[in-house]
């Protein structure tokens, strides 16, 4: 079982060899496409392969902002040729992500296909790591092999790579081991209960609040740190401000997501940025500790 997601992929190429990407769609080149063209071939060691975010079968929804559906294959290919002359293309790609049934906690293995020059899409964090503590996956690139498995998420502990234990392994060494792996990489992962934002831990409830700005401020102050897994919390509310008037947001509440973008593994600066670019309607996913002393 899979679900589809979309992501933006930026490739840098050159007019001679292009981006190393071939598209397939329709029966002949000038036929109007009734569905987006598919990636049918990725040239080895090309920009398309090295980015690690494209796979054969992905649907290309747009090329440099121009929708491919209802166009022709010739038009799509021409857009790619024109983009190669400018050395850069922005693709909007739809892809499948596996719906993995995984426990919210426990230790398990994940196998990922790997090519030498292609990143898996995993960012490892060792921030505030004490001796003997595991490395933490702080980010997973959308569209990457790691993302498409549907099993990995920020906050997962990375215990071993290809049976090499990482107990006292410096982050730099772990990154190097990952880079050098080929064919199939076996990751040993631990998920902890407290890593799951969705899980309603004892005495806590999570819900969503929608705020319409109408050009005005939200009336909230948030605090946290640049450590990726420190919580982002509401530290202040403007008196009679928009957020306070809802009655649903209080100082001390934890923000789990802004406009459906999870804050898991994100530092305070990113959360602030997400709020700044959130637009007129801001949706906040809040986690409230019910047994908090008054």
């Amino acid at each position: 079982i899979v679900h589809t997601e979309t992501t933006e992929v930026v490739l840098c190429g050159d007019p001679l060899s292009g981006f190393g990407l071939q598209l397939q769609g329709g029966i002949f080149a000038t036929e109007t496409l009734s569905s987006p063209p598919l990636v049918c071939f990725i040239e080895p060691d090309s920009p398309a392969e090295r980015c690690g975010l494209l796979q054969v079968g992905d649907r290309v929804l747009s090329i440099n902002g121009i929708a491919t559906e209802d166009g022709t294959m010739e038009e799509a290919n021409q857009l790619l040729r024109d983009a190669a002359l400018a050395h850069k293309v922005v693709l909007e790609v739809e892809f499948d992500v596996a719906e993995s049934v995984i426990p919210s906690s426990g230790t398990f293995h994940v196998k990922l296909p790997k090519k030498r020059s292609v990143e898996l899409g995993i960012t490892i964090s060792s921030a505030s790591r004490k001796r003997g503590e595991p490395l933490i996956i702080s980010d997973i690139k959308k569209g990457s092999v790691a993302h498409r498995t549907g099993t990995l998420e920020p906050g997962d502990k990375l215990l071993a790579i290809d049976n090499i234990r990482l107990d006292n392994c410096p982050m730099e060494d772990a990154v190097q081991i990952l880079r050098q792996c080929e064919d199939l990489v076996k990751l040993k992962i631990r998920k902890d209960e407290d890593n799951s934002d969705e899980l309603e831990t004892t005495g806590a409830v999570s819900y969503t609040v929608e705020l319409k700005r109408y050009g005005g401020p939200l009336g909230i102050t948030i605090s946290g740190t640049e450590e990726p897994f420190d919580p982002i919390v509401i530290s202040g509310l403007t008196k009679r401000g928009l957020a306070e008037r809802t009655g649903a947001i209080h100082v001390g509440d934890r923000i789990l997501a802004i406009n459906n973008v999870s804050l898991k593994g994100r530092p305070l600066s990113e959360a602030i940025h997400l709020l700044q670019v959130a637009g007129e309607t801001v949706t906040l996913k809040i986690k409230k500790q019910l047994d908090r002393p008054l």
Epitope: Q22, L23, Q24, G25, G26, I27, F28, A29, T30, E31, S34, S35, L38, C40, G57, M73, E74, N77
Partner: antibody
Framework: EVQLLESGGGLVQPGGSLRLSCAAS????????MSWVRQAPGKGLEWVSA????????YYADSVKGRFTISRDNSKNTLYLQMNSLRAEDTAVYYC??????????WGQGTLVTVSS | DIQMTQSPSSLSASVGDRVTITCRAS??????LNWYQQKPGKAPKLLIY???SLQSGVPSRFSGSGSGTDFTLTISSLQPEDFATYYC????????FGQGTKLEIK
Amino acid sequence: EVQLLESGGGLVQPGGSLRLSCAASGFTFSSYAMSWVRQAPGKGLEWVSAISGSGGSTYYADSVKGRFTISRDNSKNTLYLQMNSLRAEDTAVYYCARSHASYFDYWGQGTLVTVSS
Amino acid sequence: DIQMTQSPSSLSASVGDRVTITCRASQSISSYLNWYQQKPGKAPKLLIYAASSLQSGVPSRFSGSGSGTDFTLTISSLQPEDFATYYCQQGYYLLTFGQGTKLEIK
């Protein structure tokens, strides 16, 4: 391994009908357009008809338009060619081929259709 | 409809020769030109797609070039197994084949 296996060919009288089938395996059938290509004895290749992966779009060569109908059953991984009002000039080996980005990357072994009285 | 004209219709050559077959389209077809090889009693086999891309598993002595209306298939050093009939095919508007070029042993 991609395999295409045609069947249904044979001897038919002018004006008669015949239905060819092509059983596909080794790939996601519904993801690919499919075509029929024919070759008269001692002659070159002639594209006959094509159908999109979903079956929503069909195309025909002028020589068969109005007489032949291409269709597919994605649940059975099978391609069909219904041939009506057959003529002597339709005598040929009929190949089923997988259409991939405006070329044919896999072909069946062909089935012979002979139109004769 | 787009017409495809191959030349020559037949060609005699020897093992080791460099052979060139040309294909001309009645209108511009960009790079939507493919080449096939067919041996007697067998189904055609894709050699070159998109004018110059070598199909997986095809020997590197085969190469294709051209765009617009004029295209060529080149066999750099003819091998005994290369004696066959070669067809070009356009995929720009509908799908049409050239009449074929029969490559025979001299």
